[in-house]
Amino acid sequence: FKVATPYSLYVCPEGQNVTLTCRLLGPVDKGHDVTFYKTWYRSSRGEVQTCSERRPIRNLTFQDLHLHHGGHQAANTSHDLAQRHGLESASDHHGNFSITMRNLTLLDSGLYCCLVVEIRHHHSEHRVHGAMELQVQAGKGSGSTCMASNEQDSDSITAAALATGACIVGILCLPLILLLVYKQRQVASHRRAQELVRMDSSNTQGIENPGFETTPPFQGMPEAKTRPPLSYVAQRQPSESGRYLLSDPSTPLSPPGPGDVFFPSLDPVPDSPNSEAI
């Protein structure tokens, strides 16, 4: 499985609440001995490896905020410690995993990371994370709401889009190129055949310059089948970092469909043993 971040940037006014979301993609093992450990923490930009540094969220460590549940279960942090700090992490049946932060302050701005670990009977098998940025803005009216978007480093988007585009164009053009090469070779061999015929009859006629010869179209050449025009659909694609990239950087982000809206599950599932205070 992989972790995707539906949005990589959240911009919120002070005092608002925000729900940061990660989503599990791909097949998830739901065997009886498979469980998932999920948590959130803060990190810092400019690292060699994103999310490698771990910092607490409002003084709560990754272990304070963790969920641990079976592959078929939903869960949420029900202990008082997180709620006293205005935090709640939750996980639903559809692979959505979120942290809700209430009453945002400027100090909450920064890079947030989600971590998901697949555990198979006591053994940590698979660890993946996602990253997103939260920007809390001062002096906004309490009526305004948070904006979530996929804005990222435009250079990396352009590079990714160009690379993807070049690959697609290359793959689509390959049959066409091969066809043209085949045609060219057919035409060339036809010309050679005609020249040989002329050379045979040159005893009675003078040698003509083949360069000025206007060859009639060769009837034996198979016609290239007409193709329908190619349509290029821009869509969000998961990148290696778990973020979504636009295939076409100029395409605006489409609004989330009904399935994209995430409501954290609030089924009370008690917390697990925890090294930190519960």
């Epitope: 971590l115 006591h122 697990s272 925890n274």
Partner: antibody, heavy 121, light 106 residues
């Protein structure tokens, strides 16, 4: 705060059976494996086996099959280990430990204080 | 079963010294856990997943290794570090511990 409280020391006769208890508090007892570990005086730690209280699932070290039997009572948050046909080789401190998943890595996160079992004629 | 062999069995060091103890596995492992047991006490979780310190463990402790060879290092030994240290694998049943390295402070 997570705590595992074990029953007191036992002095047993060879051939007898003993049942050790481990009462858990501070977490959801049914969802985490309880591990049992043996430590003989001057020896290292030896894993006996485990029980998942919520389902009653058990796993045993082959060496202790027939010697140890695990049970759990979720109503009292207590796990039990019964040792049968005791010999002097069974004289040891027995620990219960709760699995903890820390940073996504399960390990023996919490330990009881240990129960000393002495087998003597 | 996976056998974990710890060496040395006994390690004697003076305060301030750097010490390293090793744990070798009979089969390759993804990671190793370490526990500290002081005399007369229960074992305590100490280092998880090869190199990560448990909450409250002093920063002078570190862990490293991969495959079949793992080690625990104390950069500057202190009197309170006197204990037996056990490595443990949770990769395959039966889950096993090493024989332990007893650290004595001179």
């Amino acid at each position: 705060q997570v705590q595992l409280q074990q029953s007191g020391a036992e002095l047993m006769k060879p051939g007898a059976s003993v049942k050790i208890s481990c009462k858990a508090t501070g977490y959801t007892f049914s969802r985490y494996w309880i591990e049992w570990v043996k430590q003989r005086p001057g020896h290292g730690l030896e894993w006996i086996g485990e029980i998942l209280p919520g389902s009653g699932s058990t796993n045993y070290n082959e060496k202790f099959k027939g010697k140890a039997t695990f049970t759990a009572d979720t109503s009292s948050n207590t796990a039990y280990m019964q040792l049968s046909s005791l010999t002097s080789e069974d004289s040891a401190v027995y620990y219960c430990a709760s699995e903890e998943v820390y940073d996504g890595y399960p390990w023996f996160g919490y330990w009881g204080q240990g129960t000393l079992v002495t087998v003597s004629a | 079963q996976i056998v974990l062999s710890q060496s040395p069995a006994i390690l004697s060091a003076s305060p301030g010294e750097k010490v390293t103890m090793t744990c070798r596995a009979s089969s390759s492992l993804s990671y190793m856990h370490w526990y500290q047991q002081r005399p007369g006490s229960s074992p305590k979780p100490w280092i998880y997943a090869t190199s990560n310190l448990a909450s409250g463990v002093p920063a002078r402790f570190s862990g490293s290794g991969s495959g079949t060879s793992y080690s625990l290092t104390i950069s500057r030994v202190e009197a309170e570090d006197a204990a037996t240290y056990y490595c443990q694998q949770w990769s395959s049943n039966p889950y096993t511990f090493g024989g332990g390295t007893k650290l004595e402070i001179k």
